[in-house]
């Protein structure tokens, strides 16, 4: 009978092993080993045994020991099991962005590795095991499907192989793929909310606000705002899960008409858009014309208001007759009209909205100077030693200068409190003077002496 030792060997690929072949008789006729592996007899052997060194063992093999004894021929095999770790452990690329709530399929490919019975493939999230499967096929492919939540954003996924040769070899061989970071996103199905003026006047500034809630991760979201061909430059404010993009928009005459305002929020590989129509219009303020802005009293003045051809005007609150873009009226200028405002209000309908423009002109009426009995009484009688305030008001535009002099040398303190003395008595010549001329009026002051009983 032929014996082999060891009967089983686990060795690394390319490794060497010593195998002892022995015969049961003392003097075998022949004793040897049959193997395709490179072998070397280790001398000296014994009468009934030989030691062989097998090298460069690349794959599982069963070398056979044989012996020929007087009682017959026999053989025995040793089982060589080769182990090696996989040459490639690779996690298939993850999608650049993974929507929250959608399942993610993780796929791992393992090339090589033996013995396969001892080779396990694991899919990991960080260090947490998601799936453990045997390696089957070449290359071995292992898949698992996992639900994706917001907390998976930024998580590392990898694939690990375990070659467990225990208890034969007190070793656990691990190979781990390069990790892949997952980027998750959550873009709600609702479109962004767009707040903007429905109508916008040429050369004026409007504000557009686009906002969306329920975004994750909000910092990765991008906003695109455009009015027609004009890209807007918004200022973006981020909340916890929301963003608000605010932009100023100024439109020119070339953009007059209907324009599309577009707000797009891009996150991951998805976009949510909102479109709105904005009507750009041109509406100059109406013109208020006075035949002359400064006239002398008694002059006829034509007040005219003219606006946009499609506008309807009101002049000083009175609508044009028939309703339209022009209105006018005639007046004879009086002092009461000095400083009078003529206001023209024009109304234009733009995209169902009424827009208003006003223009005001002031009329200056030149009149006077005037000194009337009502405002400058011709006679004052005052008790001696009493406190009095001489009043004399000159009227006119431009406002006249006023002086009241007695004998050209004594002024009467108009509008000032005076103590009445004999010196105050007399006739004063009051003169009101402006660039339009001069008027005079005599004012007499009488001083009553106190009666002594």
């Amino acid at each position: 009978q032929t014996s082999v030792f060891p009967p089983e060997v686990i060795l690394p690929r390319g490794g060497s092993v010593k195998v002892n072949c022995s015969a049961s008789c003392d003097q075998p006729i022949s004793l040897g080993m049959e193997t395709p592996l490179p072998k070397k007899e280790i001398l000296p052997g014994g009468n009934n045994w030989k030691m062989y060194e097998l090298s460069n063992v690349q794959e599982d093999s069963q070398p056979m020991c044989y012996s020929n004894c007087p009682d017959g021929q026999s053989s025995a095999k040793t089982l060589l099991t080769v182990y090696w770790t996989p040459e490639r452990v690779e996690l298939a690329p993850l999608p650049p962005w993974q929507p929250v709530g959608k399942n993610l399929t993780l796929r791992c490919q393992v090339e090589g590795g033996a013995p396969r019975a001892n080779l396990t493939v694991m899919l990991l999230r960080g260090e947490k095991e998601l799936s453990r499967q045997s390696a089957v096929g070449e290359p071995a492919e292992v898949t698992t499907t996992v639900p994706v939540g917001r907390d998976d954003h930024g998580a590392n996924f990898s694939c690990r192989t375990e070659l467990d040769l225990r208890p034969y070899v007190l070793k656990l061989f691990e190979n781990t793929s390069a990790p892949h970071q997952l980027q998750t996103f959550d873009l709600p199905a609702t479109p962004p909310q767009l707040v903007s003026p429905q109508v916008l006047e040429v050369d004026t500034q409007g504000t557009v606000v686009c906002s969306l809630d329920g975004l994750f991760p909000v910092s990765e979201a991008q906003v695109s705002l455009a009015l027609g061909d004009q890209k807007l430059n918004p200022t973006i404010t981020y909340g916890n899960n929301s963003l608000s993009a605010k932009a100023s928009v100024k439109v020119t005459a070339e953009e007059e008409g209907t324009q599309q305002l577009l707000c797009g929020v891009m996150l991951g590989n998805q976009t949510q858009e909102t479109r709105q129509t904005v009507t750009i219009y041109s509406f100059p303020a109406p013109n208020v014309n006075l035949t002359k802005p400064e006239v002398s009293e008694g002059t006829e003045v034509i007040v005219e208001c003219e606006a946009h051809p499609r506008a309807k005007v009101m002049l000083n609150g009175v609508p044009a007759q028939p309703p339209g873009p022009r209105a006018q009226f005639l007046l004879k200028a009086t002092p009461e009209d000095n400083g009078r405002s003529f206001s023209c209000s024009a109304t234009l309908e733009v995209a169902g909205q009424l827009v208003h423009k006003n223009q005001t002109r002031e009329l200056r009426v030149l009149y006077g100077p005037r000194l009337d009995e009502k405002d400058c009484p011709g006679n004052w009688t005052w008790p001696e030693n009493s406190q009095q305030t001489p009043m004399c008001q000159a009227w006119g535009n431009p406002l006249p200068q006023l002086k009241c002099l007695k004998d050209g040398t004594f002024p009467l303190p108009i509008g000032q409190s005076v103590t009445v003395t004999r010196d105050l008595e007399g006739t004063y010549l009051c003169q009101a003077r402006s660039t339009r001329g001069e008027v005079t009026r005599e004012v007499t002051v009488n001083v009553l002496s106190p009666r002594y009983e």
Partner: antibody
Framework: QSVEESGGGLVKPGGTLTLTCTVS????????MGWVRQAPGKGLEYIGI?????RTYYASWAKGRFTISKTSTTVDLKITSPTTEDTATYFC??????????????WGPGTLVTVSS | AYDMTQTPASVEVAVGGTVTIKCQAS??????LSWYQQKPGQRPKFLIY???KVASGVPSRFKGSGSGTEFTLTISAVQSDDAATYYC????????????FGGGTEVMVK
């Protein structure tokens, strides 16, 4: 409209001197005329005024020593018994008490009176 | 008597500076006060009337204020051309007067 003084010059103490102010471009019946003097290196000194009604008013120190009178186009200042202290430039002024703008504050260029024996 | 007291008699001021001249009436003259500027060898130039009204052609640097018995002439951003003697004159009473003019203030600009 203008005013101009004349009649200044050298006068002996105790004599009599009359200065004349000739006006043009306005009527003395509607304007008061005053006389102001200024001794060499000294300040302005008010002498008196003649009103539009011909009434005269004098500074307290000038009463009795000066007399103001007028015709239709001239205003005279008569200095009685001048002393060396009356040596000064004498100005004729229209409407010194008017409260209108400067067109009514016409000053003549002044005439120099020197009192010396 | 309606007499005028003017202070100071003289003042020195740097170009660009501000000068203030005061004038006091012995009794109320309301707002009937005028200010004059006089340069050597020239007749007085009318600056301000009715205490605060600036005569035409006078720079706005000249400002008058006051009423009753206390009056002030302020010259701001003084220029070298402002070197002169300044007089106040009461324009209220032509009788009962010693002198209708203040004694004058000589302004020297350095």
């Amino acid at each position: 409209q203008s005013v101009e003084e004349s009649g200044g010059g050298l006068v002996k103490p105790g004599g009599t001197l009359t200065l004349t102010c000739t006006v043009s471009g306005f009527s003395l019946s509607t304007h008061a005329m005053g006389w102001v003097r200024q001794a060499p290196g000294k300040g302005l000194e008010y002498i008196g005024i003649i009103g539009s009604s011909d009434r005269t008013y004098y500074a307290s120190w000038a009463k009795g020593r000066f007399t103001i009178s007028k015709t239709s186009t001239t205003v005279d200042l008569k200095i009685t018994s001048p002393t060396t202290e009356d040596t000064a430039t004498y100005f004729c002024v229209r409407d010194p008490y008017d409260s209108f703008d400067d067109g009514y504050r016409l000053w003549g260029p002044g005439t120099l009176v020197t009192v010396s024996s | 008597a309606y007499d005028m007291t003017q202070t100071p008699a003289s003042v020195e001021v740097a170009v660009g500076g501000t000068v203030t001249i005061k004038c006091q009436a012995s009794q109320s003259i309301y707002s009937y006060l005028s200010w004059y500027q006089q340069k050597p060898g020239q007749r007085p130039k009318f600056l301000i009337y009715d205490a605060s009204k600036v005569a035409s052609g006078v720079p706005s640097r000249f400002k008058g204020s006051g009423s009753g018995t206390e009056f002030t002439l302020t010259i701001s951003a003084v220029q070298s051309d402002d070197a002169a003697t300044y007089y106040c004159q009461q324009a209220y009473s032509s009788s009962n007067v010693d002198n209708a003019f203040g004694g004058g203030t000589e302004v020297m600009v350095k």
